[in-house]
């Protein structure tokens, strides 16, 4: 799978976690940090 | 299936200020970016700014800054941009798209015709 | 603001013709354009994002390329059906569209 950094516009799009783009799959992608999920690493769920 | 549903057509007097809508359904807007568009008749498409509806911050073209204000009702998965003080060149189509996880996504588009 | 700047404005050209339409961007969008195909009455319809990766049901005679601040986007060969106004966006620093290519039949 490529991947690529996310475009400056989602500077701040993931809440707790980093930005990825697929580039296979035309999406941006939150890789949340440890404890956090949802769409943006919004959510904290320990 | 995702959607967004834009209010009707407006027609209004120069000075005035409106209010369009968007209604999106089939997503959460919280997961996304709201930017609006808009195209003047026989112009070209032109980007005016964007909210992100989860922290609630916004950006604005400079030349719009301080006419335009977007904001998001997130209870009814609503965006919205008003724009004020309005003169007959702002007489165009203004979209909202979905943008954020997925690429841009339209509305429909309302028609704001400024007349006297 | 990033400012793209397409041409050319309009061009004439033949069935079967190829096609080439530039966007100049003010600086490096990392390859952050998309293309957009946009009929007289109808919202744009998005053709290609990320330089060169074709939306669903989009005919393989449209393509795009380029890197830095240079992009291309190319119908090979030019259809009826291709008439109409193209637009670039740059979306890697907020977003800035060119201006436009009226695309029409010689």
């Known amino acids: 799978v490529s991947i690529t950094k996310c475009n400056s516009d989602m500077n701040g799009y993931c809440l707790h976690g980093q930005c990825i783009y697929l580039v296979d799959m035309s999406q941006n992608y939150c890789r949340c940090e440890v404890g956090y999920t949802g769409v943006r690493c919004e959510h904290f769920y320990l | 299936q995702d959607q967004l549903v834009q209010s009707g057509a407006e027609v209004k007097k120069p000075g005035a200020s409106v209010k369009v809508s968007c209604k999106a359904s089939g997503f959460n807007i919280k997961d996304t970016y709201i930017q609006w568009v808009r195209q003047a008749p026989g112009q070209g498409l032109e980007w005016m700014g964007r909210i992100d509806p989860l922290r609630r911050n916004t950006k604005y073209r400079e030349k719009f800054e301080g006419r335009v204000t977007i904001t998001a009702d997130t209870s009814t998965n609503t965006a919205y941009m008003e724009l004020s003080s309005l003169r007959s060149e702002d007489t165009a189509v203004y979209y909202c798209?979905?943008?954020?996880?997925?690429?841009?996504?339209w509305g429909q588009g309302t028609l704001v015709t400024v007349s006297s | 603001d990033i400012q793209m700047t397409q041409s050319p404005s309009s061009l004439s050209a033949s069935v079967g013709d190829r096609v080439t339409i530039t966007c100049k961007a003010s600086q490096d969008i990392h390859k952050y354009i998309a293309w957009y195909q946009q009929k007289p009455g109808q919202a744009p319809r998005l053709l290609i994002q990320y330089t060169s990766t074709l939306q669903p049901g989009v005919p393989s005679r449209f393509s795009g390329s380029g890197s830095g601040t240079d992009y291309t986007f190319t119908i090979s060969s030019l259809q009826p059906e291709d008439i109409a106004t193209y637009y670039c966006l740059q979306y890697d620093n907020l977003r800035t569209f060119g201006g436009g290519t009226k695309v029409e039949i010689k």
């Open positions: 798209v979905r943008s954020g996880r997925l690429f841009d996504f």
